[in-house]
Interface confidence: low
């Protein structure tokens, strides 16, 4: 049976197709193609008589067709117009007529399609923002991808029923993008340039650092603030409700006790008009603030009576503090065995008596805060029991206390000494 | 039908002030954003500024020529726009367009007729 | 800010020949668009984003180019194509027009 093949079926525009033959019978006067379903004389393209080897152009002939002489028929530069049926009639021998119909689709060269907003600046959690992918092109699919991915579910994303226009019903800072839309045809796919959203957002509650509050006289203070914000938050620094400067970054140098006070960053976002303020309160004192817990080395915790001595050390890592120390809830020193050394670091008990037995801590203060030890037990026998060592009998090991404590015993001292 | 009609045009004197308006028909007024161009007599085009659509909260942006002189608004209700022009110079004679704006590529799919302003003492 | 230029600044031809308008950026650029102008007309939305047709602009119109250059040709040219035509490009917040190509007849 005579049929027609198109090779290829769909075909870009601008190039070309061949309707191909099978089946060709033999002992033919010759042919001719029509287009459309149906032989019409008003709509044939070309005849060919094989006996001539002539091939004659008919009503529909556009120069852009080519028969050969197997009865394939070439079309090139094909254009949407040529997207349809073509039928081909044989003409026999017997005079009798066969025909077979073909068809092929002409598809447009899809344009570079590009994305168009309703809201270049969409402020978040207020906006909705619609993306239509342009232009407009019958027979098109049109796809989107979010940050390179197809689209996510999401209750805030939408698109149209012909999924050209994706809609997000109500902006974040993180649906900025890069947005991409593609059509395709049966043929090729084409993507859009990215399109980045410029959402508006912020300024969110600023944040000072460092975090520091306590400072001493004599350094330099610098603060930095920072607000999440597009665009960028523009800062202002406020001391005790006064104006200071209009910048991101604050620096005293030198500062005294006078610059204590209330630090005010403010944060504001000159496209939407909000602002935020975040407060710190910043001490310069030489004092030390909030102090540490500090804590009680022996040289030993268990001594024979009337014969071993004991130091007992005061640890801390506070600066600008004073030291006590404290036995059976009484203030220390309490006899003239007990000795304080070190700015009050260490306390010395030599020799170790019978009522020297009992819990000891020390505590350290300044005229903000204190903070105590927990205690420490020193048992006093006087029998031969084995020795709880922590350090060296003779005390030789507390060089190592003391040399690691040097820096704080001087400033503890100083301290000590201009405070009381 | 999309119809977009200037009207207010006239003779004015180097620093005197007047407020063109545009009616628009034919489409959701709130959704596009609305420009005007002028065109000065016998000299190209030139784009003075635009106002965004309700979804951009009507934001407004002006050309560096215009900038604090013009000021554009729309009035939802009446689906007009209006260019208020103060301190105009000779050099602000024009024919004054508005137009339509597909969105933020400045495609101007509609043009109104255009309504003329003379500046002259 | 980009500078459109466009060439030649008059062209005349007569209908049935090819018109070519150019349209020069002075950095490269994705898209432009074109408008064409009658005298004492509002000018109209001819062709969008470089290559598209706007809604009832015949197909002998046809727009190309990329980065700098952009070209406005018209096939075969009939006598309600003798016009002004300018291209236009938009920077972030601000449109462009070239200062426009008059097509005239020979």
């Known amino acids: 049976q005579l049929t027609t093949e198109s090779m290829p079926f769909n075909v870009a525009e601008g190039k070309e197709v061949l309707l191909l033959v099978h089946n060709l019978p033999q002992q033919l006067f010759g042919y001719s193609w029509y287009k459309g379903e149906r032989v019409d004389g008003n709509r044939q393209i070309v005849g060919y008589a094989i006996g001539t080897q002539q091939a004659t152009p008919g009503p529909a002939n556009s120069g852009r067709e080519t028969i050969y002489p197997n009865a394939s028929l070439l079309i090139q530069n094909v254009t949407q117009n040529d997207t349809g049926f073509y039928t081909l009639q044989v003409i026999k021998s017997d005079l009798v007529n066969e025909e077979a119909t073909g068809q092929f689709h002409v598809y447009p060269e899809l344009p570079k399609p590009f994305i168009t907003s309703n809201n270049s600046n969409p402020v978040e959690d207020e906006d909705a923002v619609a993306l239509t992918c342009e232009p407009e092109i019958q027979n098109t699919t049109y796809l989107w991808w979010v940050n390179n991915q197809s689209l996510p579910v999401s209750p805030r994303l939408q698109l149209s029923n012909d999924n050209r226009t994706l809609t997000l019903l109500s902006v974040t800072r993180n649906d900025v993008g890069p947005y991409e839309c593609g059509i395709q045809n049966k043929l090729s796919v084409d993507h859009s340039d990215p399109v980045i959203l410029n959402v508006l957002y912020g300024p969110d509650d600023p944040t000072i650092s460092p975090s520091y509050t306590y400072y001493r006289p004599g350094v330099n203070l610098s603060l930095s603030c920072h607000a999440a914000s597009n665009p960028p938050a523009q800062y202002s620094w406020l001391i005790d409700g006064n104006i200071q400067q209009h910048t991101q970054e604050l620096f005293i140098s030198n500062i005294t006790e006078k610059n204590s006070g209330l630090y005010t960053c403010q944060a504001n976002n000159s496209a939407s008009g909000h602002s935020r303020t975040t407060v710190k309160t910043i001490t310069v004192s030489a004092l030390s603030p909030v102090v540490a817990k500090p804590q009680i080395k022996a040289s030993k915790t268990t001594v024979t009576g009337d014969k071993d001595s004991v130091n007992l050390t005061c640890s801390t890592n506070d600066t600008g503090i004073s030291i006590r120390w404290f036995f059976k809830n009484q203030s220390l020193p309490s006899s003239e065995r007990m000795k304080l050394s070190q700015g009050n670091i260490t306390l010395s008990i030599n020799p170790v008596k019978r009522e020297d037995a009992g819990t000891y801590w020390c505590e350290v203060f300044n005229p903000i805060s204190k903070n105590q030890s927990d205690p420490i037990m020193l048992n006093v026998n006087y029998n031969a029991l084995p020795q709880e060592n922590l350090i060296n009998v003779d005390g030789s090991g507390l060089n190592d206390i003391f040399e690691a404590q040097k820096i704080e015993w001087h400033e503890a001292r100083a301290h000590h000494h201009h405070h009381h | 039908e999309v119809q977009l009609l200037e009207s207010g045009g006239g003779l004015v004197q180097p620093g005197g002030s007047l407020r063109l308006s545009c009616a628009a028909s034919?489409?959701?007024?709130?959704?596009?954003?609305m420009n005007w161009v002028r065109q000065a007599p016998g000299k190209g085009l030139e784009w003075l500024g635009f106002i965004g659509n309700k979804a951009n909260a009507y934001t407004t942006e002006y050309s560096a020529s215009v900038k604090g002189r013009f000021t554009i608004s729309r009035d939802k209700s009446k689906n007009t726009l209006y260019l208020q022009m103060n301190s105009l110079r000779a050099e602000d004679t024009a024919t004054y367009y508005c137009?339509?704006?597909?969105?933020?590529?400045?495609?101007?799919?509609?043009w109104g007729q255009g309504t003329t302003v003379t500046v002259s003492s | 800010e980009i500078v459109l230029t466009q060439s030649p600044a008059t062209l005349s031809l007569s209908p049935g020949e090819r018109a070519t308008l150019s349209c020069r950026a002075s950095s490269s650029v994705t898209y432009i668009h074109w408008y064409q102008q009658k005298p004492g007309q509002a000018p109209r939305s001819w062709i969008y984003?470089?290559?598209n047709l706007a809604s009832g602009i015949p197909a002998r119109f046809s727009g190309s180019g990329s980065g700098t250059d952009f070209t406005l040709t018209i096939s075969s040219l009939e006598p309600e194509d003798f016009a002004v035509y300018y291209c236009q490009h938009w920077s972030s917040k601000s449109p462009t027009f070239g200062q426009g190509t008059k097509l005239e007849i020979k």
């Open positions: 984003a470089t290559s």
């Open positions: 034919g489409f959701t007024f709130t959704d596009y954003y």
């Open positions: 137009t339509r704006d597909r969105g933020i590529r400045f495609q101007f799919d509609y």
